[in-house]
């Protein structure tokens, strides 16, 4: 194998999705055609068949139909291979065999890598922390390759080693979803640090956490209200839920029970020293007096506007105190759509028409969306616009324009996000010529 | 530990403008409304101004209305206080306070002194 | 002229009790809750009651707050030297937007 054939020495690093190139060459003597020529490139480990270009012509890819030549360059001794879309498994090995008069080889290492992601920081608990309590952190980075290193440390940068577990899981394409866990006591406060480590590509990936232990006053009344928003109608009444558990012996006297909007800490409704202090909230709202002792702090809000949309602090102070937010999501059904036409008469195929969709009074604004009698979506040639009256609600109107079949039903659909409702119409445009609307 | 560190308080002429700052450590500073307090010499305490936490609602006192801005940075963790137009009455030590959930003002700073003086 | 009212001075002599008022209206003091600011001499206020009667950690248990309609009031029992000090009351006013202060009770003890 008299052949010199030359390849890097170091491994060709190549991010996962994207394309590499292996470099090989080759000194063609003088007088050298490509007819003379054997090639042949195949993993290192099985020989496996990658690619190769035998009798002047290149055989093509054996590998996935993802490798390629350099065609314009092998008359001058470039026998590089380029990898498309690479991927982990191909991760190895690749020798590159040339055989003119005399042969030769070489092996080419590829290295795949894939950065992580910038870590996720979650806490176990994440609410009402004190110093020495012990909490949880995880750290999670993903679809990252090869496998991560992982370090913690703390806001003084002093590393972190007791208490670490980490767990690493490749999926189905390879790459590796780092999860990293640290436990650790509270002091006063502490910031803790995460860094995940990609060894081949150098790249760190980091998050911190700082955690503030609560603070005197401390509010330790449990308050609780639905995670979820409540969702009410306009013009309808909606009940905020909010309740706290009373202690044996309490009594109205001591509760301060004040409604507010979260944003704004505008008073909504409060009750303090036994009494209902009453609505300070357009006399929209009420409490629920006889369950108050039961621990029952809920809001009635009657003819809801969608003004009102948002958040509600639900404030308790008895001995301590807590509180606590609940959402309002406001919500209007649209009306059944309006259709017409224009033109709307001597119709014929080929006529270009515009169809206008109308709903009207909902809320929030809506999801417009146009068919036709096959249930296809018409998707081209569609402006809708939305517009909101004084009390907030939207008026939807979506014009279509359309080049007529001979005959065509179109269909328009109007949902309402919040309330998954739909409002349909249609419009069936038929025979030729013709009249909208039909005449009776 | 949690603290509220004033700056920026000086000597201006009356008509100037200043900016005060607040750096808030040890507290999650972008969960709390916070408030401008002052307080004139011998005299007792003054609100000044609050904001919420994201810093999209502003409330002022009469005596501040349309001179003065407050405003904040929560990736910097700092309180601003912008004074246009300042009058020898708007003379005091400028107190920065945390304002909690519970609506109690729990954490202020040491003060910085502005002096309006001709 | 302060929204809320205090007297401007109160004294005792040690191991007395004392105690201040904050008078309001039903827009601050009857619908919201009261906190309680002591202020030593050359120094940042420091909270010494929120909610009306609770206590910080760090407060010894001689002072206690209450509130009745629209005033509240500030109780120091076995009155000591260190007390010696300006006292505030402070509340949110849901018709002003603002938070109100008392004008402040100069304690000393004699």
């Known amino acids: 194998g008299a052949l010199e054939v030359q390849v890097p020495e170091d491994p060709v690093v190549a991010l996962v999705g994207t394309d590499a190139t292996l470099c090989c060459s080759f000194s063609p003597e003088p007088g050298f055609s490509l007819a003379q020529l054997n090639l042949i490139w195949q993993l290192t480990d099985t020989k496996q068949l990658v690619h190769s270009f035998a009798e002047g012509q290149d055989q093509g890819s054996a590998y996935a139909n993802r490798t390629a030549l350099f065609p314009d360059l092998l008359a001058q001794g470039n026998a590089s291979l380029r990898l498309q879309r690479v991927r982990v498994a191909d991760e190895g090995s690749f020798t590159c065999f040339v055989s003119i008069r005399d042969f030769g080889s070489a092996a080419v290492s590829l290295q795949v890598a894939a950065p992580y992601s910038k870590p996720s920081m979650t806490l176990e608990p994440n609410k009402d922390l004190r110093p020495g309590d012990t909490v949880t952190i995880t750290c999670s980075s993903y679809q990252g390759y090869p496998e991560a290193e992982v370090f913690w440390q703390d806001g003084q940068g002093v590393p972190l080693t007791g208490n670490v577990t980490t767990s690493q899981m490749a999926n189905e394409q390879g790459l590796f979803d780092v999860h990293s866990i640290l436990r650790v006591v509270l002091g006063a406060n502490g910031t803790y640090s995460c860094l995940v480590r990609n060894p081949v590509l150098q790249q760190d990936a980091h998050s911190s956490v700082t955690i503030t232990p609560q603070r005197s006053p401390t509010g330790a009344v449990e308050v609780q209200v639905p995670e979820d928003p409540v969702v009410a109608l306009v013009g309808t009444d909606a009940t905020l839920r909010c309740s706290f558990s009373p202690e044996p012996g309490f009594s109205l006297a001591q509760l301060n029970l004040i409604w507010q909007l979260t944003d704004t800490k505008q008073l909504v409704h409060s009750f303090t020293e036994g009494r209902d202090q009453g609505s300070a909230y357009a006399n929209r709202t009420a409490l629920f007096p006889d369950l108050l002792a039961q621990g029952n702090a809920s809001l009635r809000l009657q003819r809801v506007r969608v003004a009102d949309e948002g958040s509600f602090t639900c404030f308790v102070s008895i001995r301590d105190f807590g509180s606590a937010a609940v959402s309002l999501q406001v919500a209007a059904p649209y009306s059944k759509p309006s259709m017409t036409l224009e033109p709307n008469k001597d119709l014929r195929p080929g006529d270009t028409v515009t169809i206008t969709c109308s709903s009207y009074r909902g809320y929030p604004e809506a999801e417009v969306f146009w068919q036709d009698g096959q249930g296809v979506p018409l998707t081209g040639n569609v402006t809708t616009s939305q517009m909101a009256n004084e009390q907030g609600l939207f008026d939807v109107h979506s014009v279509l324009r359309v080049v007529l079949g001979a005959n065509g039903t179109y269909s328009c659909l109007v949902r309402n996000p919040v309330l998954q409702q739909d409002a349909h119409g249609s419009v069936t445009i038929t025979g030729q010529p013709m009249t909208f609307p039909p005449e009776a | 530990e949690v603290q509220l560190l004033e700056s920026g308080g000086d000597l201006v002429q009356p008509g100037g403008s200043l900016r005060l700052s607040c750096a808030a450590s040890g507290f999650t500073f972008n969960t709390y409304w916070m408030n401008w307090v002052r307080q004139a010499p011998g005299k007792g305490l003054e609100w000044v101004a609050g904001?919420?936490?994201?810093?999209?609602?502003?409330y002022y006192a009469d005596s501040v209305k349309g001179r003065f801005t407050i405003s904040r940075d929560n990736s910097k963790n700092t309180l601003y206080l912008q004074m246009n137009s300042l009058r020898a009455e708007d003379t005091a030590v400028y107190y920065c306070a945390d304002w909690n959930d519970y609506d109690i003002m729990d954490v202020w700073g040491q003060g910085t002194t502005v002096t309006v003086s001709s | 002229q302060s929204v809320l009212t205090q007297p401007p001075s109160a004294s005792g002599t040690p191991g007395q009790t004392i105690t201040i008022s904050c008078s309001g209206s039903s827009s601050n003091v009857g619908r919201r809750t009261v906190n309680w600011y002591q202020q030593l001499p050359g120094t940042a206020p420091k909270l010494l009651i929120y909610?009306?009667?609770q206590r910080p950690s760090g407060v010894p248990d001689r002072f206690s707050g209450s509130k009745s309609g629209t005033s509240a009031s500030l109780a120091i029992s076995g009155l000591q030297s260190e007390d010696e000090a300006d006292y505030y009351c402070a509340t949110w006013d849901d018709s002003l937007n603002a938070w109100v202060f008392g004008g402040g009770t100069k304690l000393t003890v004699l």
């Open positions: 904001i919420n936490s994201k810093g999209g609602v502003t």
């Open positions: 909610t009306n009667a």
